[in-house]
Amino acid sequence: EAHKSEIAHRYNDLGEQHFKGLVLIAFSQYLQKCSYDEHAKLVQEVTDFAKTCVADESAANCDKSLHTLFGDKLCAIPNLRENYGELADCCTKQEPERNECFLQHKDDNPSLPPFERPEAEAMCTSFKENPTTFMGHYLHEVARRHPYFYAPELLYYAEQYNEILTQCCAEADKESCLTPKLDGVKEKALVSSVRQRMKCSSMQKFGERAFKAWAVARLSQTFPNADFAEITKLATDLTKVNKECCHGDLLECADDRAELAKYMCENQATISSKLQTCCDKPLLKKAHCLSEVEHDTMPADLPAIAADFVEDQEVCKNYAEAKDVFLGTFLYEYSRRHPDYSVSLLLRLAKKYEATLEKCCAEANPPACYGTVLAEFQPLVEEPKNLVKTNCDLYEKLGEYGFQNAILVRYTQKAPQVSTPTLVEAARNLGRVGTKCCTLPEDQRLPCVEDYLSAILNRVCLLHEKTPVSEHVTKCCSGSLVERRPCFSALTVDETYVPKEFKAETFTFHSDICTLPEKEKQIKKQTALAELVKHKPKATAEQLKTVMDDFAQFLDTCCKAADKDTCFSTEGPNLVTRCKDALA
C-alpha cells in the first residue's frame, strides 16, 4: 500500500540500527572516495530527518521519494566535482535520471588501498571503546570497495564480525581466536560479493526475465517439492528484492527481503521440509540461512521429463499458448530433477530446448524434429562435467597455489593483453574453486564449480569493459552470461599477440620481499609468472616450472642469507640470465 512518507515507512519497518546501516552502505556505494566521517555525518542527518517524519508524516519534505532525499544529500557534499569529476554532472539531472547516473558511475575497481585488518589488540580496543563506530567503519570500508554488495547480507556479515569480536576480545590470546574466524568471514563475504555482482550484471544487461529464469532454476533445485506456482511466486519476489538492491534501493530491498523470509517461514509446508532451523533464527541470520539452505529431498515419483516436453502431442500448442510459462515449466521440471547441475547449465539446456521448439514447431512434422532434443542435451552436459573432472584432478595434484599458477599460465596465454594485476587476481580467484568445490561430494561439485567460475569471470568482464584490450575477452564477455564460462574455457593461445620484450627490472627483486606475508609473496611470484608468459606465450609447462622452481630457490636462499641485500643484488642478475636461457 502507498505510504504518505516513504522514509518514515522504511524507518519503522527496519528499525533504527538497520536503517542507519543501510543508509551508510548506500552512501558508501555511491560515493566511494568519501571518508567514513563524511558519510557518518550524512547518515545522522538522514536518520534525524526520518525521525521527524515518523513523528509527523506531513512534515516538510517527508513525502519525497528516497532517491530524491538521498540524491539531494549526496549532491550537497562540498567539493563534489573536485573529488568525483563527472559524477557531479549527475546532480544537474532530475530523478529518476539522477539515480541512474549515480549507478553508472559506480566503480567496480576503485583505486583504494586494500582493506588492512589492524592487529588484534588495537582492534579490540577500538571495538570496546565504540562498537557502533567500529561496525560503521566495517560497513563503510566493505561497501565502498564493493559497490554492489548485497546490502542486507552485508549487515549480516557485520553482525558476524561483531559476534566474533565480542567473543575473541574477551580471550587471552585474541590473535589466534580472531584470525581464523575473521578470515572465514572475509572469504565468505568476498564470494558473496562476486555472486551478487553477477546477479546485478544479469539484471543490468539482460533484464528481469533473465534474472527470474536464474531464480526459477535455483529455487526449483532447492525446493523440488514446491509446485510451479509457488516457485514462480518466490522467483518473482526474489527478482524484486535483487532489482531493488542492484538499483541502489537498499531500504526497500532489505525490507522486501525480510518480507520474503517471513513468507517462506509461514509457508514451509508448501515450500520445503528443510526450513525450520533457519526460521528459528533472528532476521539477518534467518534470511542468510534461507539463502543457502540445503536442498529438500526430491519427490520419489517424478515422471520422466520427456512425457510432457517431448512425447505429449500438445508440445507446440502449449508452447504457442504461453511461451514463457511453458519454458518456465520446463526449466522448473528439469531443475528440480537435477540438483547436481549448475544453474548456468540448466539455463543453457532451457535455451537449447527453446531454440529447438522455435525451429521444430515451425516445421510440418514437429514431433519428428523435436523428438531427439533430450539426446542433444548430452554434449552440453558432458562439457562442464569434463571441466570439473579435469580441474579437480589438477587441483588435487598441485594444491591451491600450484593450481592457481596453472590457471594463470592458461589465462595469460588466452588473453596476454590483459593487465598482469587483473590476470593475477582472476587466476587466484579462479584457483580457489579447487579448495571451495573439489572437496565436496560428487553431486555437489558441478554446481559449485561452474556457478563460482561464472561469477569470477563476470568480474573479469567488468574490469575488461573499463579498458578493453583483448578481442578474445571482448568476444566471450559480449555473449549471454550463461555462455561465458564455456567460451573462456574454449579459448586457446592468442596467436595475434606480439610477445613482450624481456625487461630485467620486471624480474628484479629486493630483500623487502622476505618480510612480506605469504599471500603477498605469492602475488609477487605470480606477477613474475604472468610476465614470463607474456614474454614467451608458447613456453612449455616444463620450461615455466624450471624457471619458477629456480625463482623459488633464489628467494629461499637470499631470504635466509645473513646479508640479504648483497645476496639479492648478486644472485638476482644470475637468476635473470638463467631465466632467459631456460626460455630461449
Epitope: E314, V315, C316, K317, A320, C361, A362, E363, A364
Partner: nanobody, 115 residues
Framework: KVQLVESGGGLVQPGGSLRLSCAAS????????MSWVRQAPGKGPEWVSS????????LYADSVKGRFTISRDNSKNTLYLQMNSLRPEDTAVYYC????????SSQGTLVTVSS
C-alpha cells in the same frame, strides 16, 4: 489465449469439392506448423495433413494424397484445406491443430459426403 475457428464444412456429393478455413489468433501464427485432423463418427482422431510455418513444406496422409491440398496465408493468420474428389469415407468433423497434435481444442467443422 490461443483460438482456432474452423469453417467451410457442409454437405457435398461424392466427387465434389470443399474448401475449409481455420482462423487462428492468440499466437504468432507464422512461427508454427499447422495440421488438419479429422474424426469420423465413432472413430478415433486421424491426421490428415500438415504444413510448415512458412508454407514451404507439406505432408499428407496416404488416404488423401493427390486429392487434398493444404495451404496457409500468414498475412491473414488463416489455414486452408482444399478438398477435391470427396468420398463418403471423408465424412468427419475436421479440426485444425498446432504442430502435429491429434488433440482437438476447437469446435471443428462437419464435412458430410453423401449422395
Amino acid at each position: 489465449k490461443v483460438q482456432l475457428v474452423e469453417s467451410g464444412g457442409g454437405l457435398v456429393q461424392p466427387g465434389g469439392s470443399l474448401r475449409l478455413s481455420c482462423a487462428a489468433s492468440g499466437f504468432t501464427f507464422s512461427s508454427f506448423g499447422m495440421s488438419w485432423v479429422r474424426q469420423a463418427p465413432g472413430k478415433g482422431p486421424e491426421w490428415v495433413s500438415s504444413i510448415s510455418g512458412s508454407g514451404s513444406d507439406t505432408l499428407y496422409a496416404d488416404s488423401v494424397k493427390g486429392r487434398f491440398t493444404i495451404s496457409r496465408d500468414n498475412s491473414k493468420n488463416t489455414l486452408y484445406l482444399q478438398m477435391n474428389s470427396l468420398r463418403p469415407e471423408d465424412t468427419a468433423v475436421y479440426y485444425c491443430t498446432i504442430g502435429g497434435s491429434l488433440k482437438q481444442s476447437s469446435q471443428g467443422t462437419l464435412v458430410t459426403v453423401s449422395s
